[in-house]
């Protein structure tokens, strides 16, 4: 018997210091480029090897970025979001939403959660 898949959503504040090659990640999303149906939010699509985000270790592919240095990322065009990151300065504070996949087995059994990609 297969269990249903649920998601555990958590939020975290991540402070990154811009490295020699920048912050070290890619994003998708925006009002003109929806990554998730009916959601114009900004999502992390790639963490670059040895970049600031990878070395910090907390930001994950698939995370939703809610704000940058306190500025909300809701209802932004994709390029406007990109520009916001590029102009965010040396110390960058990200409010992110992680979504962990939790496999619920048959009644009485709860499987372990895996980060969703």
């Amino acid at each position: 018997m297969n269990g249903r898949v649920d998601y555990l959503v958590t939020e975290e504040e991540i402070n990154l210091t811009r490295g020699p090659s920048g912050l070290g990640f890619n994003i998708v999303g925006g009002t003109d480029q929806q990554y998730v149906s009916n959601d114009s939010g900004i999502y992390v699509s790639r963490i670059k090897e040895n970049g600031a985000a990878a070395l910090d270790g907390r930001l994950q592919e698939g995370d939703k970025i809610l704000s940058v240095n306190g500025q909300d990322l809701k209802n932004l065009l994709h390029q406007d979001a990109v520009d916001l990151f590029r102009n965010a300065g040396y110390a960058v504070s990200l409010r992110v939403q992680h979504r962990l996949q939790v496999q619920n087995g048959p009644i009485g059994h709860r499987g372990e959660g895996d980060p969703s990609g």
């Epitope: 090659s21 920048g22 912050l23 070290g24 990640f25 890619n26 994003i27 998708v28 990554y35 992390v44 699509s45 790639r46 963490i47 670059k48 090897e49 592919e61 698939g62 994709h78 390029q79 990109v82 990151f85 590029r86 969703s116 990609g117």
Partner: nanobody
């Protein structure tokens, strides 16, 4: 994680054609940059062709330009490598690779251009 499964390899005579396919699962395919790499006997793995997540930018190894074509079908979560006018030196294990696409938050130019972090198991292509 992203899972990649290649198919379409085999034995073909010089001058012949093969079409490799790579089916991806595990996350939205339309957000992935895709690539084909190959490892020839006794050599390192080389990039053959890449296609970005939007499908509007491709790259080809000089020696395959005009003979190989990379394409993607986002509805089928699949990337293809059409290989024509095959030569014995194309004999290799061909690997499908993926990475997250999207826009770099750092600059318009991507460092580590061929840095891919998800790999298939490979499919053998032998040209006799």
């Amino acid at each position: 994680d992203v899972q990649l499964v290649e198919s379409g390899g085999g034995l073909v005579q010089a001058g012949g054609s093969l079409r490799l396919s790579c089916a991806a699962s595990g996350r939205p395919f339309s957000s992935l940059d895709m690539g084909w790499f190959r490892q020839r006997p006794g050599k390192e793995r080389d990039v053959v062709a890449t296609i970005n997540w939007t499908g509007d930018s491709t790259y080809y190894l000089d020696s395959v330009k005009g003979r190989f074509t990379i394409s993607r079908d986002n509805a089928k979560n699949t990337v293809f490598l059409q290989m024509n006018s095959l030569k014995p030196e194309d004999t290799a294990v061909y690997y499908c690779a993926a990475r997250g696409g999207g826009s770099s938050v750092d600059s318009e130019y991507d460092v580590g251009e061929f840095e891919y972090n998800y790999w298939g198991q490979g499919t053998q292509v032998t040209v006799s």
